[in-house]
């Protein structure tokens, strides 16, 4: 056969679907690789062909579209499973071609099992809710296109093994789940089960997402530098190790980049000749407020180093702050025989 533009195995599209549930999978060619859509391709006389390679096999084989009850079918650029089976796991290829043109891409499809509490190897999307922020909602994801708008599905929401009913501050409202006032206790995995009829059969769609309650923008403040501060003086003798921690608290801010850096005499440590090392550690609170600590270290400090200006800087979407460390050279302890003796009037 003639050459085909092969986009390879698109591992970015690691598609996971639940066993015994419907799945609709769009050919990734039109979404990520080609500059035209399926309708344009179809009207230009191009044909979309599907085939697959079973898990742990090398042999590419056509997809059987003649299974009972049309279990697997194709509609435009969508491959449908009604429903999936565990052994549908494998690499699927969609190829667009005519006599003069060919383009194809493969993607992995994993059919996963869930237990009665909806635990599974499925990678879960994370939805962040602001703590004590007023009514916030999550929506049952990825259910569009499974049934026409004329069909009214039933939706049941769960937290773990338990149906969400009579909860203090969580109310199921169809496809939405409303949190009247989100609290830390609302952290966890939430599952919606959408049940709908089709051609005399009943299908279930299960979608689980993780809710993480985070700091509210109402409470967000600019970075706070806890150290260095005015109460601690770093007093060293030449030859000793100088260690200065810069500890900064950052309020949680959605999509904010938190930065901490040191300057020495107004320059970044990389831009000066001192042998300085900086180690960073990061910790998070339960609401994802962040504490960053950068420890500036000079193994053998010189008297010149002890005259320099050491400033810790921090920046977030809320603002920028800086604080200088108080560094000084330790006055050598007096030598008894000379200084002290003189003090006592000895000649």
């Amino acid at each position: 056969s003639e050459r085909c533009d092969d986009w390879g195995l698109d591992t970015m599209r690691q598609i996971q679907v639940f066993e015994d549930e419907p799945a609709r999978i769009k050919c990734p060619l039109f979404e990520h690789f080609l500059k035209f859509n399926y309708s344009t391709a179809h009207s230009a006389g191009l044909t979309l062909i599907w085939y697959w390679t079973r898990q742990d096999r090398d042999l590419e084989e056509p997809i059987n579209f003649r299974l009972p009850e049309n279990r697997i079918s194709k509609e435009k650029d969508v491959l449908w499973f009604r429903p999936t089976l565990l052994n549908d796991t494998g690499n699927y290829t969609c190829m667009l071609r005519n006599t003069t043109y060919c383009s194809k891409v493969a993607f992995p499809l994993e059919v996963v099992q869930k237990d009665s509490c909806f635990n599974s190897p499925m990678k879960l999307p994370v939805h962040k809710l602001y703590i004590e922020y007023g009514i916030q909602r999550i929506t049952c994801p990825n259910v569009d296109g499974y049934f026409p708008s004329s069909v009214k599905p039933t939706i049941t929401w769960y937290m773990g093994c338990y149906k969400i009913q009579n909860f203090n501050n969580v109310i199921p409202e169809g496809m939405n789940l409303s949190f009247l006032i989100a609290l830390i206790s609302n952290n966890g995995n939430y599952t919606c089960v959408v049940t709908y009829p089709e051609n005399g059969r009943t299908f279930h769609l299960t979608r689980t997402l993780t809710v993480k309650v985070v700091g509210s923008p109402k409470n967000a403040v600019p970075p706070v530098i806890h150290s260095p501060n005015d109460h601690v003086v770093y007093e060293k003798e030449p030859g000793e190790e100088l260690l200065i921690p810069c500890t900064v608290y950052f309020s949680f801010l959605m999509d904010s980049r938190n930065e901490v850096w040191w300057t020495i005499d107004g320059k970044k440590p990389d831009d000066i000749t001192i042998d300085v090392t900086i180690n960073e550690s990061i910790s998070h609170s339960r609401t994802e407020d962040e504490t960053r600590t950068q420890i500036l270290s000079i193994k053998k400090v010189t008297s010149e180093d002890l005259k320099r200006s050491y400033v810790c800087h921090a920046r977030s979407a809320k603002g920028e702050v800086a604080k200088a460390a108080k560094v000084k050279q330790k006055v050598p302890a007096p030598r008894y025989t000379v200084e002290l003796a003189c003090g006592f009037g000895a000649t």
């Epitope: 009665s116 937290m159 009579n166 966890g188």
Partner: antibody, heavy 122, light 107 residues
Framework: QVQLVQSGAEVKKPGSSVKVSCKAS????????IQWVRQAPGQGLEWMGY????????DYAQKFQGRVTITADESTSTAYMELSSLRSEDTAVYYC???????????????WGQGTLVTVSS | EIVMTQSPATLSVSPGERATLSCRAS??????LAWYQQKPGQAPRLLIY???TRATGIPARFSGSGSGTEFTLTISSLQSEDFAVYYC?????????FGQGTKVEIK
């Protein structure tokens, strides 16, 4: 180590109510559910309902709807099961049980209280 | 509601022998089945969940098998402390339901 300690035995008259308590010690930070199960003398186990103390969610078995109320006081880590309109057939040992989290499939009855005998007699 | 039926009601076994207990569900419960042991005057104790996974601290002589509607609890070599009543429980569908129990007694 999580433990569940239940209130003592009760003798009740038909038509009255009983309230059994179940105090959890060493509770984890994560939400969990407290289940209530009863066992009539020489009989099997019968699930009555549950409550999730930190979230308020609860549900009851159809058989007990309207007669049972399960509540919880988070501040004292104590759950309560109140059964009203008692009859002689309600004579049983009432157990509370729990798992570590809301997500442990099959381990929602991991830890059990010692049981509370409720005798209904005129 | 799913009905769980255990058999036999009573099983007489000599110490050291193998005991096989059965549990049948009125409809498929997948592998969402647990087994409990209850001794006189005590609360039940979780032995097996997920049809075949031993709970923490349960000896290896206890094993579970089955899926769908047919399940088995096997005690490979009965010890004196194993004489008790055993209950199966499904947690596939609400309400979660228990079997009526199998009493394992000394022959």
């Amino acid at each position: 180590q999580v433990q569940l300690v239940q209130s003592g035995a009760e003798v009740k008259k038909p038509g009255s109510s009983v309230k059994v308590s179940c105090k959890a010690s060493g509770s984890p930070a994560e939400p969990y559910a407290i289940q209530w199960v009863r066992q009539a003398p020489g009989q099997g186990l019968e699930w009555m309902g549950y409550i999730i103390p930190s979230l308020g969610g609860y549900d009851y078995a159809q058989k007990f709807q309207g007669r049972v109320t399960i509540t919880a006081d988070e501040s004292t880590s104590t759950a309560y099961m109140e059964l009203s309109s008692l009859r002689s057939e309600d004579t049983a040992v009432y157990y509370c049980a729990r798992g570590q989290t809301l997500y442990d499939s099959g381990r929602q009855f991991d830890i059990w209280g010692q049981g509370t005998l409720v005798t209904v007699s005129s | 509601e799913i009905v769980m039926t255990q058999s036999p009601a009573t099983l007489s076994v000599s110490p050291g022998e193998r005991a096989t207990l059965s549990c049948r569900a009125s409809q498929s419960v997948s592998s969402n089945l647990a087994w409990y042991q209850q001794k006189p005057g005590q609360a039940p104790r979780l032995l097996i969940y997920g049809a075949s996974t031993r709970a923490t601290g349960i000896p290896a002589r206890f094993s579970g098998s089955g899926s769908g509607t047919e399940f088995t609890l096997t005690i490979s070599s009965l010890q004196s402390e194993d004489f008790a009543v055993y209950y199966c429980q499904q947690y596939n569908n609400w309400p979660w339901t228990f079997g009526q129990g199998t009493k394992v007694e000394i022959k």
